[in-house]
């Protein structure tokens, strides 16, 4: 169908509550484009009827609410005047809330579930809520270890929980809860956050930590478009450079003529005591010569690589 495939990261989500994912890919969606969502390579688009439990809302896919059976790979197809890109998003739904049981709950703790408070300082936690503008979010309630937070050291300010004079007892499992209203119906959103306490001003010393990749291989079909993020945590005051290299050469220099493989523009999210940096590498079209080569993400003295490999042949097709 002429669409280039782009594989995005996995998302881990909680069942029985709303979830939304926005189909944005800056090089493409900045212009005049149409966006259509599909599930599991279905030819039938996700409904745009707002009464449907799963429906497309402008560039978003919206689940009201998410259910366990919604796990799977979703594709959004971005069509421009002269281009077509298919972005794949893998959604994994876990079934149980931590406060009800530890069984069948959050299967692993990725960075978005972790936040840090500084001992003895005034600090804050953030409730990350990402929904289209058709969703109205009510005031946020905060919980610690499954009990609503009360006390004069804690103040709720929009999406943040302000904590004054942080103590060691403030570590633990927090959750922020909001009521989301959509088309007159109300839904509860509950996000878990694991909070650790640190005395350090820096983030794990001055050596940057590469969260992803982790020195592994990625199966990718010949001819597809692939985007891989390098996610790095580092101190706020760091002077480290982050880049992608192949054969010890910057990818932009190595592929200077063809520009087939390019490094993306670096972005970062600022946390209380560190920054999370993202710089991607884009393979506009994977070629045979790319397989088996280590593509290295560098961040200061830290390095991590990915190696592209052809998927194993599926003999069931014959």
């Amino acid at each position: 169908d002429g669409c280039k495939d782009i594989f995005m990261k996995n998302e881990i989500l909680s069942a029985s509550q709303p979830f939304a994912f926005n189909c944005t890919f800056p090089p493409i969606t900045s212009g005049e484009v149409s966006v259509t969502w599909y599930k599991n390579s279905s030819k039938i688009p996700v409904s745009k009827i707002i009464q449907s439990r799963i429906h497309q809302d402008e560039t978003w896919i919206l689940f009201l609410p998410m259910e366990w059976g919604d796990s799977g790979v979703y594709q959004c197809v971005i069509k421009g005047r002269d281009s077509c890109h298919r972005i794949h998003v893998n959604l994994t739904v876990f079934e149980k809330h931590w406060c009800d049981t530890s069984i069948g709950g959050l299967p692993n703790l990725s960075d978005e579930y972790k936040q840090i408070l500084h001992l003895g300082k005034d600090d804050s936690l953030t409730c990350h809520l990402h929904f289209p503008k058709s969703c109205v979010l009510g005031p946020i309630k905060w919980y610690k270890d499954c009990n609503e937070i009360k006390g004069e050291r804690f103040t709720v300010l929009e999406t943040r929980l302000l904590v004054s004079n942080v103590s060691a007892e403030d570590r633990g499992n927090y959750a922020c809860q909001a009521i989301l209203t959509h088309s007159g119906k109300q839904y509860e959103v509950l996000n878990g956050i694991t909070v650790s306490i640190t005395e350090r001003a820096g983030y794990g010393g001055s050596v940057p930590k590469i969260i992803y990749p982790k020195n592994h291989s990625i199966e990718v079909q010949l001819g597809t478009t692939l985007i891989v993020d390098c996610n790095v945590t580092d101190t706020k005051d760091n002077t480290n450079l982050r880049c992608w290299r192949v054969n010890n050469t910057l990818v932009d220099d190595y592929y200077d003529e063809s520009k087939r493989i390019r490094e993306g523009v670096e972005t970062h999210v600022s946390f209380r005591e560190h920054n999370l940096y993202t710089v991607n590498i884009t393979f506009l079209e994977v070629k045979m010569e790319d397989y088996g080569l280590p593509f290295m993400c560098h961040a200061g003295v830290s390095t991590a690589y990915i190696i592209l490999q052809l998927p194993a042949p599926d003999f069931r097709a014959y």
């Epitope: 069984i103 709950g105 692993n108 270890d145 009990n147 633990g172 499992n173």
Partner: antibody, heavy 119, light 108 residues
Framework: QVQLVQSGAEVKKPGASVKVSCKAS????????IHWVRQAPGQGLEWIGE????????NYNENFRNKATMTVDTSISTAYMELSRLRSDDTAVYYC????????????WGQGTLVTVSS | EIVLTQSPGTLSLSPGERATMSCTAS???????FHWYQQKPGQAPRLLIY???ILASGVPDRFSGSGSGTDFTLTISRLEPEDFATYYC?????????FGQGTKLEIK
């Protein structure tokens, strides 16, 4: 470092009750779930149930609902399991284990408490 | 409940040999919730492999785990004397939590 220290061995008569303790240290007790697992002599592992010290929520294996009662005392970071109406087939080593958010497995176990039921 | 069946019940091998044991679930278990424990006589179980294939802290890399759905495998590439013990598979996906009946790895 995380530690779970259980109470010592017990010998009980049939029909009696016993209360086993599990003292936690090295982490935020109310930010975990404590699970109880038993192992009869020469047998495998059998899950009894779990308790959340933060909100005192309990979930039991149906096979133990009328046998075990799990409680906590957060002031001393200790979990308890009481076994009632003891029978000889309740003779076993009883373990506590801890589970943390986003880590659905047992990274730390108590050393075990042997409960012997004999007339 | 999810029944986990381990095979073989007993595995008799010599140090230096390769050990392979399997665990079959009566219904599908997400790989994120499947784990292996090692237990030696008179000791509490010890987490060996979690999330199907990740080695727990301090576990030597001669141990490996694999599998998905209903079929999971634990492999020890080259047996050391301290590896002779009983191994249990475990699922954390559905209540009640269940364990396999164990595979006893003994010295031949």
């Amino acid at each position: 470092q995380v530690q779970l220290v259980q109470s010592g061995a017990e010998v009980k008569k049939p029909g009696a009750s016993v209360k086993v303790s599990c003292k936690a240290s090295g982490y935020s007790f109310t930010s975990s779930w404590i699970h109880w697992v038993r192992q009869a002599p020469g047998q495998g592992l059998e899950w009894i149930g779990e308790i959340n010290p933060g909100n005192v929520r309990t979930n039991y294996n149906e096979n133990f609902r009328n046998k075990a009662t799990m409680t906590v005392d957060t002031s001393i970071s200790t979990a308890y399991m009481e076994l009632s109406r003891l029978r000889s087939d309740d003779t076993a080593v009883y373990y506590c284990a801890v589970v943390f958010y986003g880590e659905p497995y047992f990274p730390y176990w108590g050393q075990g408490t042997l409960v012997t039921v004999s007339s | 409940e999810i029944v986990l069946t381990q095979s073989p019940g007993t595995l008799s091998l010599s140090p230096g040999e390769r050990a392979t044991m399997s665990c079959t679930a009566s219904s599908s278990v997400s790989s994120s919730y499947f784990h292996w424990y090692q237990q030696k006589p008179g000791q509490a179980p010890r987490l060996l492999i979690y999330r199907t294939s990740i080695l727990a802290s301090g576990v030597p890399d001669r141990f490996s785990g694999s599998g998905s759905g209903t079929d999971f495998t634990l492999t020890i590439s080259r047996l050391e004397p301290e590896d002779f013990a009983t191994y249990y598979c475990h699922q954390f996906h559905r209540s009640p939590l269940t364990f396999g009946q164990g595979t006893k790895l003994e010295i031949k």
